[in-house]
C-alpha cells in the first residue's frame, strides 16, 4: 500500500495505490483511491509512467482528456467514470503487454488539494492449474497442466499424507512455448501416486502462485485450484 500526500499551497489530499500484477494479453487494473470531492468537475486524475514522455491517461471535468496520451497507451486505458466522484481513480488497462511493467504515478487534483502515490506494476502470465489422473500412464500418475506462465515458474509437488516429502525424483516437469513465443504451457507429471491421499501441484513465479489440489480415493477423484498474486502491497 502506498499512501501519498500533496505538498502544494492548497491542502494535501491522501492518495492510495496498491502494487499489482497484470496478466499479459488480458485486461488489468491499476488501483488508486483518493479523498473524494463533491463536484466531479473539480477532479483531475492523471496517470503517469516512469520513463514515458506522454501521459498514460487523464480525466478532467468529468471526462477523458487524451490529447497528451502516450502512443503506447492509445485506446487501451479507461477510468471508472461513474466511480470517480466516490474517490476511485483506478485505471483499467486493456490487453496488458510485458512492456507495461514499471512504476506508475496516480496524481490527483481536487478542490481540497493535490496528492499522488506511486504504484509498482508487474507483468507476466499466470493461470490456474488443473490436476487430473493421467489415464495414458501404465501406473497411477497425476498430470498437472497450466496453459500460460511467464517468467518460467517453479513446480513443486506435495502430499497431505507424506508432508515434507520431496517429490522431485518421482516427478517430471516440462515447459512448452506457446504460439505467441512469450508465455509457456506448464506440464508436470507425478508418478507412484498412492490412493486415499490429497496431492498438490504448486506453480510459482515472482508474480503469482497457483495450486492445484486433487484428492484421490479408490472410487473417485475431486479437484480444486486456486491462484494468488504475490507482492500486492498498498502504498
Amino acid at each position: 500500500l502506498i499512501i501519498g500526500f500533496g505538498i502544494s499551497g492548497r491542502h494535501s489530499i491522501t492518495v492510495t495505490t496498491v502494487a499489482s500484477a497484470g496478466n499479459i494479453g488480458e485486461d488489468g487494473i491499476l488501483s488508486c483511491t483518493f479523498e473524494p470531492d463533491i463536484k466531479l468537475s473539480d477532479i483531475v486524475i492523471q496517470w503517469l509512467k516512469e520513463g514515458v514522455l506522454g501521459l498514460v491517461h487523464e480525466f478532467k471535468e468529468g471526462k477523458d482528456e487524451l490529447s497528451e496520451q502516450d502512443e503506447m497507451f492509445r485506446g487501451r486505458t479507461a477510468v471508472f467514470a461513474d466511480q470517480v466522484i466516490v474517490g476511485n481513480a483506478s485505471l483499467r488497462l486493456k490487453n496488458v503487454q510485458l512492456t507495461d511493467a514499471g512504476t506508475y504515478k496516480c496524481y490527483i487534483i481536487t478542490s481540497k488539494g493535490k496528492g499522488n502515490a506511486n504504484l509498482e506494476y508487474k507483468t507476466g502470465a499466470f493461470s490456474m492449474p488443473e490436476v487430473n489422473v493421467d489415464y495414458n500412464a501404465s501406473s497411477e500418475t497425476l498430470r498437472c497442466e497450466a496453459p500460460r506462465w511467464f517468467p518460467q515458474p517453479t513446480v513443486v509437488w506435495a502430499s497431505q499424507v507424506d508432508q515434507g516429502a520431496n517429490f522431485s525424483e518421482v516427478s517430471n516437469t516440462s515447459f512448452e512455448l506457446n504460439s505467441e513465443n512469450v508465455t509457456m504451457k506448464v506440464v508436470s507429471v507425478l508418478y507412484n501416486v498412492t490412493i486415499n491421499n490429497t496431492y498438490s501441484c504448486m506453480i510459482e513465479n515472482d508474480i503469482a502462485k497457483a495450486t492445484g489440489d486433487i484428492k484421490v480415493t479408490e472410487s473417485e477423484i475431486k479437484r480444486r485450484s486456486h491462484l494468488q498474486l504475490l507482492n500486492s502491497k498498498a502504498s
Epitope: 488443473e130 489422473v133 479408490e218 472410487s219 477423484i221
Partner: antibody, heavy 116, light 106 residues
Framework: EVQLVQSGAEVKKPGASVKVSCKAS????????IHWVRQAPGQGLEWIGE????????NYNQKFKGRATLTVDKSSNTAYLELSSLRSEDTAVYYC?????????WGQGTLVTVSS | DIQMTQSPSSLSASVGDRVTITCSAT?????MHWYQQKPGKAPKGWIY???KLAHGVPSRFSGSGSGTDFTLTISSLQPEDFATYYC?????????FGQGTKVEIK
C-alpha cells in the same frame, strides 16, 4: 426427506441462453457437491460439471467450458445451470444430482428444447 | 477422456434368466459405478464402488471387475429389472458414462 426439485421445461431459440434451477431440501446444502448431467432424446448420459455449494468451486467437462455456468444461491439452497449459445444438439433433459454416496438423489429433470 | 464401452447395447431376456452386462474402460479406473434408468425417469444409483449395492437394491444384483473391465450381473431377472443400465467412472475428469445397455422382455 432429501429432495432436489428442478424448474419446468423450457423452449429456446438457437443462440439463446437457458437457466435451469435445482432446489435442494432435507439436508445441509453446503455439505454435498451438486452435479449436472444431461440426456439427449434416446441417448445416454453426459456429465456437464460439478459445484461445491460451500464455496461455489466448480469443475467442468471441457466440452461445456465457456458455455455452461454453474452457480448456487446458499440463501435459498438452490443450484443453477446456465447454458448459453444454445444449438439444436443441446435439446436434452438436464438433471441435477447430489454428490454420490451410498444413496444418490436426482432432480426430476428439466427438458430444454432448442428449436427455431 | 476415458471412454466407456458397454456390451451388449441391448438384450432381450425372460424373467428368471441370468443377465450379464459388461463395461470396458479405455484406461484403468480402479472402480466402477452403475445406474439404472427407467423411461421418463431420472437415473438411480444402483451399484457403487464396483460391487456395493445402493440402498434398496435387491441382492440378485451384483457387480465385479477391476482395472478396465467390469460386470453387472442379475442372477434371476425380475419384471421390475427391465430398464437401461449405465456404467460410470469418476476416477478421471471429465466423469463419463457408458452408452447404456437396454434390458428388454423377450
Amino acid at each position: 426427506e432429501v429432495q432436489l426439485v428442478q424448474s419446468g421445461a423450457e423452449v429456446k431459440k438457437p443462440g439463446a441462453s437457458v437457466k435451469v434451477s435445482c432446489k435442494a431440501s432435507g439436508y445441509t446444502f453446503t455439505n454435498f457437491w451438486i452435479h449436472w448431467v444431461r440426456q439427449a432424446p434416446g441417448q445416454g448420459l453426459e456429465w456437464i460439471g460439478e459445484i461445491d455449494p460451500s464455496d461455489s468451486y466448480t469443475n467442468y467437462n471441457q466440452k461445456f467450458k465457456g458455455r455452461a455456468t454453474l452457480t448456487v444461491d446458499k440463501s435459498s439452497n438452490t443450484a443453477y445451470l446456465e447454458l448459453s449459445s444454445l444449438r439444436s444438439e443441446d435439446t436434452a433433459v438436464y438433471y441435477c444430482s447430489r454428490e454420490i454416496t451410498t444413496v444418490d438423489y436426482w432432480g426430476q429433470g428439466t427438458l430444454v428444447t432448442v428449436s427455431s | 477422456d476415458i471412454q466407456m464401452t458397454q456390451s451388449p447395447s441391448s438384450l432381450s431376456a425372460s424373467v428368471g434368466d441370468r443377465v450379464t452386462i459388461t463395461c470396458s474402460a479405455t484406461s484403468s479406473i480402479s472402480y466402477m459405478h452403475w445406474y439404472q434408468q427407467k423411461p421418463g425417469k431420472a437415473p438411480k444409483g444402483w451399484i457403487y464402488d464396483t460391487s456395493k449395492l445402493a440402498h434398496g437394491v435387491p441382492s440378485r444384483f451384483s457387480g465385479s471387475g477391476s482395472g478396465t473391465d467390469f460386470t453387472l450381473t442379475i442372477s434371476s431377472l425380475q419384471p421390475e429389472d427391465f430398464a437401461t443400465y449405465y456404467c460410470h467412472q469418476r476416477r478421471s475428469y471429465p466423469f463419463t458414462f457408458g452408452q447404456g445397455t437396454k434390458v428388454e422382455i423377450k
